[in-house]
């Protein structure tokens, strides 16, 4: 008869660690030993394999190794078969997951004074205990504006307010070990009394004596204050304008208008919004005065008939960047043909005697226009 000297026994195991289910048999003749898992034969793999009559696990897996193992001994001559007692693993494991928003259904629905529930998706066996953190600081049970229980994976903020804003993470620990959230959740709850930007001023470039407008708007409840400052922290109001900003007007909607702009008005303008609570918001924009420098002189050119030549016009430095074009006999040159403009270049292909004359490079921007002539002579061979 086949006798089991050692039978497998149920045991605790740790996810990913080694384990061994022992089985030893004694029989009058040779026997063939194999293992069943939930009644199905166990195939050897690198992770789980027969070691003599025992079953060895290089790394226990909570999904593949859950169930009932049985050691079976069979005498292939007589057909006699004996089965061991059932054995199973109590696998201890812990697996990290993200912090997710459980309530409300989407971030867009989070409003001040509503209840917000976050869920820590760390699972394990035995059931882990949870610890929540906001911006890396542990949250304890004793605080009145949130409910957290180390046994529960949920964190409830009721009612949620701006003070709850921050990065939420969680950690869990059990007999197996510890794991922390693989992805954290940023909760952002606006304080209605904090100033928020609605419209930010943009840099502007204007010609001398023209007008410039900066738009700036903030929102808050109650409505925020708005103030304009220039360069040296000089406040600009309709009542107290600094001497160099006599032609400045601040509108009720926050826009700042500067008329008859002069060089001394160029610089950085700051728009400052202040809510009932929270820090001031400072937005900056620069007023540039348009400018255009002179163009370098061209040397006269002598070209040979039949050749192809180019004359590059160097655009003058200017703000905004000047546009450049070529003219001949008062007519702007086309972008293709035999004599044409390409970018800043004047191109003369297969030069003819009739191409001789004065060609003018023009450059223009808000500040004005500059021009420079080049005299082209065509030499015939």
């Amino acid at each position: 008869a086949i006798v089991f000297i050692k039978q497998p026994s149920s045991q605790d195991a740790l996810q990913g660690r080694r384990a061994l289910l022992r089985c030893e048999v004694e029989a009058p003749g040779p026997v063939h030993v194999y293992w069943l898992l939930d009644g199905a034969p166990v195939q050897d793999t690198e992770r789980r394999f027969a070691q003599g009559s025992s079953l060895s696990f290089a790394a226990v897996d909570r999904l593949q190794d859950s169930g009932t193992f049985q050691c079976v001994a069979r005498d292939d001559v007589t057909g006699e078969e004996a089965r061991s007692a059932n054995a199973s693993f109590n696998i201890k494991w812990i697996e990290a997951g993200p912090v997710v928003l459980k309530h409300p259904a989407s971030e867009a629905e989070i409003q001040p004074q509503t209840q917000v529930t976050l869920r820590c998706h760390i699972d394990g066996h035995p059931r882990p205990t949870y610890q929540w953190f906001r911006d890396g600081t542990p949250l304890s049970d004793g605080q009145s504006n949130h409910t957290v229980s180390s046994k529960e994976r949920n964190l409830t903020l009721r009612p949620a307010g701006p003070e709850h804003s921050g990065l939420y993470s969680c950690c869990a620990h059990s007999a197996f070990g510890q794991a922390c959230s693989s992805q954290n959740f940023t909760l952002s709850i606006a304080d209605e009394s904090f100033a928020r930007v609605v419209l930010a001023p943009q840099d502007v470039v204007v010609a001398r004596y023209e007008e410039a407008m900066f738009h700036c708007q903030f929102s808050a409840q109650p409505p925020p204050s708005l103030q304009w400052l220039f360069e040296d922290e000089t406040p600009i109001t309709n009542r107290s304008r600094p001497p160099h900003l006599r032609r400045a007007t601040v509108f009720a909607n926050g826009s700042l208008l500067l008329t008859q702009v002069r060089p001394r008005n160029a610089g950085i303008y700051r728009c400052i919004g202040q809510g009932q609570r929270g820090p001031p918001i400072i937005l900056e924009a620069t007023l540039h005065l348009a400018e255009i420098e002179d163009m370098p002189l061209f040397e006269p050119r002598v070209f040979t008939a039949g050749s192809e030549e180019r004359v590059t016009c160097l655009p003058p430095k200017g703000l905004p960047e000047p546009s450049v074009w070529w003219e001949h006999a008062g007519v702007r040159l086309p972008t293709h043909g035999r004599v044409y403009q390409k970018g800043h270049e004047l191109v003369l292909a297969n030069i003819a005697e009739s191409d001789a004359g004065v060609y003018t490079c023009h450059a223009a921007n808000l500040a004005g226009q500059r021009r420079q002539d080049v005299n082209i002579t065509v030499a015939t061979v």
Partner: antibody, heavy 117, light 111 residues
Framework: EVQLQQSGAELVKPGASVKLSCTAS????????IHWVKQRPEQGLEWIGR????????KYDPKFQGKATITADTSSNTAYLQLSSLTSEDTAVYYC??????????WGQGTLVTVSA | DIVLTQSPASLAVSLGQRATISCRAS??????????MNWFQQKPGQPPKLLIY???NQRSGVPARFSGSGSGTDFSLNIHPMEEDDTAMYFC?????????FGAGTKLELK
């Protein structure tokens, strides 16, 4: 505002071809040249060639002749660079640039071409 | 082809100090009184940006601390005073004739 928008990164097999695009906004490509420049990882800049989109005239650095073909479609304001018989040596970022003269005054963001089996 | 030799290959300069990068052409890049030498700045992951064209002409919108000089075959780019934002690769390029050619580049770092 002048902008050059290049097509996305390409992963191609050795021996294959690839066609990169460069679409201009804020100006007509007919009015300028469009240049193409190659930059291998951690290396310098190499001029491939240029096209005059108004007439299709193209010029190349001799070392890119046969490897690169530059074309343009003025109706879509787009220039193209076709690279053929690709090898690992062609792995690089390829830039298009607007040339108001023979220099790039505005550049595209670049297209990374990776040649790998 | 016109070969451009840039030096030094790398340069470390303290804030507020002067950085000078040189570029020598294998032949003159002058044509009718214009030196066709340009300078570009390139930061990691970005395309090159034109700073100076025709040896000494500052591109619109480029800070005044960038200046270019030279003629014929010898050119230089000066940056003064050096700022943190100027850490980048700098390339010279000749645009006198096709094929257009670039220098090998100078890596400018903060000391």
């Amino acid at each position: 505002e002048v902008q050059l928008q290049q097509s996305g990164a390409e992963l191609v097999k050795p021996g294959a071809s690839v066609k990169l695009s460069c679409t201009a906004s804020g100006f007509n490509i007919e009015d300028t040249y469009i240049h193409w420049v190659k930059q291998r990882p951690e290396q310098g800049l190499e001029w491939i060639g240029r096209i005059d989109p108004a007439n299709g005239n193209d010029k190349y650095d001799p070392k890119f002749q046969g490897k690169a073909t530059i074309t343009a479609d003025t109706s879509s304001n787009t220039a193209y660079l076709q690279l053929s018989s690709l090898t690992s040596e062609d792995t690089a970022v390829y830039y298009c640039a607007r040339g108001d003269a023979n220099y790039g005054s505005y550049w595209g963001q670049g297209t990374l071409v990776t040649v790998s089996a | 082809d016109i070969v451009l030799t840039q030096s030094p290959a790398s340069l470390a300069v303290s804030l507020g100090q002067r950085a000078t990068i040189s570029c020598r052409a294998s032949e003159s890049v002058d044509h009718f009184g214009v030196s066709f030498m340009n300078w570009f700045q390139q930061k990691p992951g970005q395309p090159p940006k034109l700073l100076i064209y025709a040896a000494s002409n500052q591109r619109s919108g480029v800070p005044a601390r960038f200046s270019g000089s030279g003629s014929g075959t010898d050119f230089s780019l000066n940056i003064h005073p050096m700022e943190e934002d100027d850490t980048a690769m700098y390339f010279c390029q000749q645009s006198k004739e096709v094929p257009l050619t670039f220098g090998a580049g100078t890596k400018l770092e903060l000391k």
